[in-house]
Structure formats: structure tokens, C-alpha cells
């Protein structure tokens, strides 16, 4: 009834969980919104209250913590489902309060179904492996806190629909999946299913991630400008359209920002009083090496424009390069009637 700091619906935390599997969801207040943790709040006499709004309903209702086998429970700042049901989908709110203080946040929870090959509407994390780089591992994600260390779970790994066994270069090692050497053929969706017992019941956690094999840092080079180059001259007459492509190859580099830009007479095109447009296109190789093309276009070039310096620049974490385009004004072809006749000594 009294005022409550309402952080609204935290759509950044779009939580998706599989039907019929356990889910443990931490109240986002302590992770993103407040400067203190649950223990501090609890010892200060604050109480954490949970409630929810069902999918396609407006009515907020308390969560039923008295379901058979404690299917839904709360432990400290965690809301537990053991397991989820499809109709648990909705917006969940955790509220921290006492007589003088109140703060709350809501977040969406979606319970999704998977098919027999683990396909689902779940948004998949992407794990990048370097091509032919030596041993690399992926780890079954988001399974911490579900069972104590005394419990020894069973972990089964799948690639797509198939159990990973007798693969030449991929070896299941418990929670890890080791790639002895990664190839393009290792691209795909990998699923780990963790099976563990709890209170006389068996639970399963299914986690799928996408593996993308990318260029190795061993093979990475500074940007390479393929165009402009010394073999192509851009010869134009005033009034014609000038089109100069700048095409740059970037090796894949994790977390590198690849940049391409033009300068005209050492300035950015925006700072030059001419009608210039730049269109960019980007393409990727199978290993996520990148080719960026920026086409500089002047619709009706002037003789003044044809005297300017046009330089393409490129930068990545591996270095910076630049290349000037050779731009010339076309010498008009002689007109036969006057120039050639004079040349032949006609009178």
C-alpha cells in the first residue's frame, strides 16, 4: 500500500527454462539494482516476498509454496522449481521490504518445450573455438548450485540428435567436452544433459550451446586492403559519377572492433563541402574472417574533386593500414574535325 521503489519489468533477464526440469532463479534485485546482498538485507530485518502474474493475465497473485513435493520453494534469494511446468510461464516479482523500506523488480520466465533432438525456442549461447588450435574445451553451462558436491551426476553430451561417442576429435569428459583439434565440421549445437538424484527423485538439466569454429589467432594478420590498389586508376570526366570501393579483409580476432573509413584530403567526408555518400557492406567467411567494403560515391564529380586525395583506412586489434586511390581527370579525346584536321596539315 505504501510507496515501493519499482524497478519495473527487467526484460534484460528473459529467463528461459525447459519444461519438467529444475530451475533456480535468483532475485535480480541483489544482482543488478541494489548495492547490498541478500544476507545484509536479511540481517537488517528485510523480508523477501515473491509473487507472479500468469501469462496473458493482469492479476498479481502469491506463489503457492504448498504444492505437493515442494515443487516451488524459496531458499534465501533463490526461487526454486523442482521441476517446472509449462504453465509456470509468466512475470515473477521479488519484493524486499520492511515497515520503512520497499523495493521490487519483475522479470519474465518462459517455460519452453524441446523436441526429441533438443531443438526449442531457447536462445542459445555461442561458444567460439579457434580452428586447428590444439585442445579446447566447452563446459556444461549454468548447472552450479543445483546439487551438492557430494552428489555425482551423470553427464551425457550430444551433438544435434546424437550422443557423442567414438568421435575422432571430440571427447566427453564429465562436465567438459574436449575438442582435440577443432574443424569447420565441428560447427553445430551441443547439448549436455546432467542427471542427478534428489530426495528419491531423478532430475535432469538440459543445456544447449552453439559451437562456432573461427579463425585462429595464430593465423591473424593486420587488415589487408584489396581495393583501392596500384593497378586500378579511377579516371573520370567532370560531371560523371565517381565510385571508389574500399575492400578490406580482416582476420577473425575475438572481441576486436574492425573499422573502415575514408578520408578526403585528410578529412572525414562529412567535413568536406561536397555531396559524397558512403555505403558499407559486410560479408563473413566460414571462420568469421570479415570482408568490409565501403563504396565512396560522388554523383557529379567536379574537376576540383578529381584533384583531391582519397584514402581508405582500416583498423583492427592487429594494426592500422591505409591506401590511397589513384584518381585522375580524363583527358578529353581530340575532336576529329578540328584537332585531327589541323594535325594532318589540312587547309
Amino acid at each position: 500500500s505504501e510507496r515501493c521503489d519499482d524497478w519495473g519489468l527487467d526484460t534484460m533477464r528473459q529467463i528461459q527454462v525447459f519444461e519438467d526440469e529444475p530451475a533456480r532463479i535468483k532475485c535480480p534485485l541483489f544482482e543488478h539494482f541494489l548495492k547490498f546482498n541478500y544476507s545484509t538485507a536479511h540481517s537488517a530485518g528485510l523480508t523477501l516476498i515473491w509473487y507472479w502474474t500468469r501469462q496473458d493475465r493482469d492479476l498479481e497473485e502469491p506463489i503457492n509454496f504448498r504444492l505437493p513435493e515442494n515443487r516451488i520453494s524459496k531458499e534465501k534469494d533463490v526461487l526454486w522449481f523442482r521441476p517446472t511446468l509449462l504453465n509456470d510461464t509468466g512475470n515473477y516479482t521479488c519484493m524486499l521490504r520492511n515497515t520503512t523500506y520497499c523495493s521490487k523488480v519483475a522479470f519474465p520466465l518462459e517455460v519452453v518445450q524441446k523436441d526429441s533432438c533438443f531443438n526449442s525456442p531457447m536462445k542459445l549461447p555461442v561458444h567460439k573455438l579457434y580452428i586447428e588450435y590444439g585442445i579446447q574445451r566447452i563446459t556444461c553451462p549454468n548447472v552450479d548450485g543445483y546439487f551438492p558436491s557430494s552428489v555425482k551426476p551423470t553427464i551425457t553430451w550430444y551433438m544435434g540428435c546424437y550422443k557423442i561417442q567414438n568421435f575422432n576429435n571430440v571427447i566427453p569428459e564429465g562436465m567438459n567436452l574436449s575438442f582435440l583439434i577443432a574443424f569447420i565440421s565441428n560447427n553445430g549445437n551441443y547439448t549436455c544433459v546432467v542427471t542427478y538424484p534428489e530426495n528419491g527423485r531423478t532430475f535432469h538439466l538440459t543445456r544447449t550451446l552453439t559451437v562456432k569454429v573461427v579463425g585462429s589467432p595464430k593465423n591473424a594478420v593486420p587488415p589487408v586492403i584489396h581495393s583501392p590498389n596500384d593497378h586500378v586508376v579511377y579516371e573520370k570526366e567532370p560531371g560523371e559519377e565517381l565510385l571508389i570501393p574500399c575492400t578490406v579483409y580482416f582476420s577473425f580476432l575475438m572481441d576486436s572492433r574492425n573499422e573502415v573509413w575514408w578520408t578526403i584530403d585528410g578529412k572525414k567526408p562529412d567535413d568536406i563541402p561536397i555531396d559524397v555518400t558512403i555505403n558499407e557492406s559486410i560479408s563473413h567467411s566460414r571462420t568469421e574472417d570479415e570482408t568490409r567494403t565501403q563504396i565512396l560515391s560522388i554523383k557529379k564529380v567536379t574537376s576540383e574533386d578529381l584533384k583531391r586525395s582519397y584514402v581508405c583506412h582500416a583498423r583492427s586489434a592487429k594494426g592500422e593500414v591505409a591506401k590511397a586511390a589513384t584518381v585522375k581527370q580524363k583527358v578529353p579525346a581530340p575532336r576529329y574535325t578540328v584537332e585531327l584536321a589541323c594535325g594532318f596539315g589540312a587547309t
Epitope: 511446468l85 518445450q113 523436441d115
Partner: antibody, heavy 117, light 107 residues
Framework: QVQLQQSGPELLKPGASVKISCKAS????????MNWVKQRPGKGLEWIGR????????HYSGKFKGKATLTADKSSSIAYMQLSSLTSEDSAVYFC??????????WGQGTSVTVSS | DIQMTQTTSSLSASLGDRVTISCSAS??????LNWYQQKPDGTVKLLIH???GLHAGVPSRFSGSGSGTDYSLTISNLEPEDVATYYC?????????FGGGTKLEIK
Amino acid sequence: QVQLQQSGPELLKPGASVKISCKASGYAFSSSWMNWVKQRPGKGLEWIGRIYPGDGNTHYSGKFKGKATLTADKSSSIAYMQLSSLTSEDSAVYFCGEGYLDPMDYWGQGTSVTVSS
Amino acid sequence: DIQMTQTTSSLSASLGDRVTISCSASQGINNYLNWYQQKPDGTVKLLIHYTSGLHAGVPSRFSGSGSGTDYSLTISNLEPEDVATYYCQQYSILPWTFGGGTKLEIK
């Protein structure tokens, strides 16, 4: 508490067909495999096949292709196995078995099928 | 298809005994092996999955081990309710196949 309740015993003539059922409760029917297993009197267990009710995907043992047809009704959480062109060789107890993955975690009580002229 | 062999079709042991039942596969099955118990009344239960994973609710006197083609189920302290037939089953490659079963009786 997972429960699989199978339909009652069947006495049939050679050449007939039979459809036996397995009613599931206590888990998400659509998200687990339903297996079917045959046991001839005094003999061991033979895997017939399985169905994933969520998408209808089926796998059969080669020996039972053409003999058994597996279906599932998600709305009622019932799995079915139809056996066709029955002979005395089909006289057996048939079990359904639920598995989230490949192991059959929970089994039905079995349905006895007797083929006799 | 992968052939599963349980060489001992029946065995007799005393209460409190440690009993081991073995199972072999015609090719490597990468630990994808389950053990099931079928009681005299016909009811079937999963005991062990993935060679050594104890199924929920199964007493800890049951344990499994093995690798490659050779696997075993051990009952460490035989109880009267353990009278049953025990089946191994591979789930490495479809179709899943069972061993012929080992019938365990009390002396």
C-alpha cells in the same frame, strides 16, 4: 511420482490386430521418450521401439518394423502400441517404459497379449 | 545390432553375501549401460544408469562398474527383497538391446 498404467490383458485370434495403451502421469508426457519392450513367457526382454510424444519422432528395432506402430496422444498423456497380423510368436507381456533420455526410468506393469486360435 | 551377453543365467547366494553379475557387449558401448531388476511378480525397475549412476530411490548396496565391453552389477549385502532377475541393457547404438538376464535366488 511417475506412474504408467497399462491396459488390460488381451486374448486374440491369429491375423488380428491389437492396440494397447499406456496412461502416463506424474511427469511432462511430451518431454520424455516412451519405450515399448516385449517379454515372451519365461524369456528375456526385447526392445521394440520408442516415441517422443512432443514431436512424434519414433525409432524402431528392425525386427519390429511393420509389426508394431507407436503413437501418442499428448492431450490425454496416453501412448499406444498397435500390433498387426498377430501370430503365436506375438504372445507375450508388453511393457511401456518412460525415459527422459535413453534409460527407461519408470516402467508400466505390463499388458499380457495371448494369440490363440 | 549390439549383442549383450550375461553368461550366468542363474545364481544362488546367501543373505548378506556380496553378489556380482556380469554382462559383456559385442562391441564397445562407451559406458552407455543400464541395469534393470525384474521382480518375480513381473515389475521392472531401473537400478543403475550409465554404468555406475544409481537411480533415485535405489538402495546404495547396489553399484555398477565397467568400461569398454565388460560391465558388472554388484549387490554388496544381499537382502531377501533382492530376489529377482537382473538385465543389462546397452543404449550406445539403436536398437537398444538387453542381456538374457541373470536370475538371483537365495540359498
